[in-house]
Amino acid sequence: NIDVCKLGTVTVQPAPVIPLGSAANISCSLNPKQGCSHYPSSNELILLKFVNDVLVENLHGKKVHDHTGHSSTFQVTNLSLGMTLFVCKLNCSNSQKKPPVPVCGVEISVGVAPEPPQNISCVQEGENGTVACSWNSGKVTYLKTNYTLQLSGPNNLTCQKQCFSDNRQNCNRLDLGINLSPDLAESRFIVRVTAINDLGNSSSLPHTFTFLDIVIPLPPWDIRINFLNASGSRGTLQWEDEGQVVLNQLRYQPLNSTSWNMVNATNAKGKYDLRDLRPFTEYEFQISSKLHLSGGSWSNWSESLRTRTPEEEPVGILDIWYMKQDIDYDRQQISLFWKSLNPSEARGKILHYQVTLQEVTKKTTLQNTTRHTSWTRVIPRTGAWTASVSAANSKGASAPTHINIVDLCGTGLLAPHQVSAKSENMDNILVTWQPPKKADSAVREYIVEWRALQPGSITKFPPHWLRIPPDNMSALISENIKPYICYEIRVHALSESQGGCSSIRGDSKHKAPVSGPHITAITEKKERLFISWTHIPFPEQRGCILHYRIYWKERDSTAQPELCEIQYRRSQNSHPISSLQPRVTYVLWMTAVTAAGESPQGNEREFCPQGKAN
């Protein structure tokens, strides 16, 4: 806080603003009749240097000239860029206890002359926008630097606007607030930027442009689409544009897509016909504009129009499968199943399915509509039956898909050979087979069908299936395949009027079961012991069980137990053993084995055979 220099003055030579690397002389002079006493020789002038309000140096040793008691000149060098404060103080040497008294001060700014501004770029957003230019100022000058943007053009007019850079703000862009209109489309404009500060000035090279070079059209607005005759594949996209637009770019894509369809339209006048849309599909549309065919810039993309194309009648054929079960000697239950059409085939919301079961000689026809993807009916066991299903939306129905109802596993000669199931990874199984050896008629197709081997799965869950062409002998099944679950897999070979099948179990990943089977009873019949058990609960099986093991040993024996290995069958829950001694107490238990290993043992049961065993 320097008082208004009552005691004296401070001056700087050559100037208070100097280029980097230059020296300056600071002179501090006392006003007449100011000082410590009537003895001027006791006046000592000192110069203090402050940077950011912090005292950094006493320049006592930098005196270059001294009029004892009246004035002193100090040379300052190596000043850093920016502002430095120098304060001159009066030190009265005969009174050591008094602090030096401020006389006056000065700020010296060190900087550089501005470089010529470069890379001038001007834009006008929209036909009614205003011209704004930006540039690269070059190195920081560390001084207040004024920039003047000057635009010259037709009608002998020059427009200019100014801004400045200092340590608080940067000036590298100016909006002139002036609009260039389309009537000047052919005119040339010249823009230049001049920079000036206390150490010099510089000017950019002139930058020449036309209206078309700098005007970026506003993005199109009010976008809408009209579908011709409610067509799902043809529509007219309409939008509003600025008047001078001659070129548009359209891009559109289904909402879940990752790549755009791109179209260029010349002189579209806010209208363009699209002919390749997918019915009943959510689309996103955007448009960009340009004022000139070859030059100029594209506008930003418009806001998206999101809309769904109308429905069209379904195409494609349904994938049908069925199950046949005899109810009694003259009736059978037919369960038809089909897969939903994919969206590109459904082309709308499927409202219902039309199902027909027909006896080939046309004696009987059963028809129904359902919203489900399955249908069950009881029909006579006599006659040859055929089924057909079609899918309907609001615009119409797909062509019906036909399938002959045959006895799927009725012909042993059509049974595929050497069926195997190998786990490929966590969620699929590779099924392979060999064709039937002595088929009477040609195989038209194979069906690979699978179902989880869990209680009630036949009644609760529809089957999963894959249609395989007759020249393929493998299928990778993945739909609804989960690890640690065992599936029954059937491979059907179908001819025109017959069917044969082979069955196998498989899993995609397996572990040793969590527990062993639970022995429920041990009974003695005709000198043999029958072991009965309950199967391991489905979640604890952890894959396909290959076999069970029954272990036994004499109670309190330390010898290794004996064992009997049984091939796993779901229907089997008891097994005889015949190598136990009578009137000896045995301990028995069971384990289960998957491809991954053996389960812990199940419950232990003691038993003492009574009769003559062996």
């Epitope: 007019l157 427009c159 606007k161 607030g177 609009n179 209109s181 009537d183």
Partner: nanobody, 126 residues
């Protein structure tokens, strides 16, 4: 109602300087432009310079560029035209005018300015 009042005209020797003032009142929007025109006897009205009150952009006719400066004093609602190195052909009545203008092509068009002052005479003698 917008009112414009020019002052500062007079007789000046060739090579001399003059500062014209235009005091404006009733301008309800900072988007106005204030411009100076001049009309010599027997000639059409000619654009000299203009200033945009909001952003401070200045527009000059090339005929006087380098010899005149237009600037404003917001506190006094006054726009000044400083003219230096005056020539005999600068003799004319100088008018101040205002309008809502932002198109480049419209600045020199007198019909785009809605309000006009009475004018002040500038005479340059040899």
């Amino acid at each position: 109602q917008v009112q414009l009042q020019e002052s500062g005209g007079g007789l000046v020797q060739a090579g001399g300087s003059l500062r014209l003032s235009c005091a404006a009142s009733g301008l309800t929007s900072s988007t106005y432009v204030i411009g100076w025109f001049r009309q010599a006897p027997g000639k059409e009205r000619e654009f000299v310079a203009a200033i945009m009150l909001s952003g401070g952009t200045t527009i000059y006719a090339d005929s006087l560029k380098g010899r005149c400066t237009i600037y404003k004093d917001n506190a006094k609602n006054t726009v000044y035209l400083q003219m230096n190195s005056l020539k005999l052909e600068d003799t004319a009545v100088y008018y101040c005018a205002s309008g809502l203008i932002y198109r480049y092509s419209d600045f020199p068009r007198s019909q785009k300015y809605n309000f006009w002052g009475q004018g002040t005479q500038v005479t340059v003698s040899s």
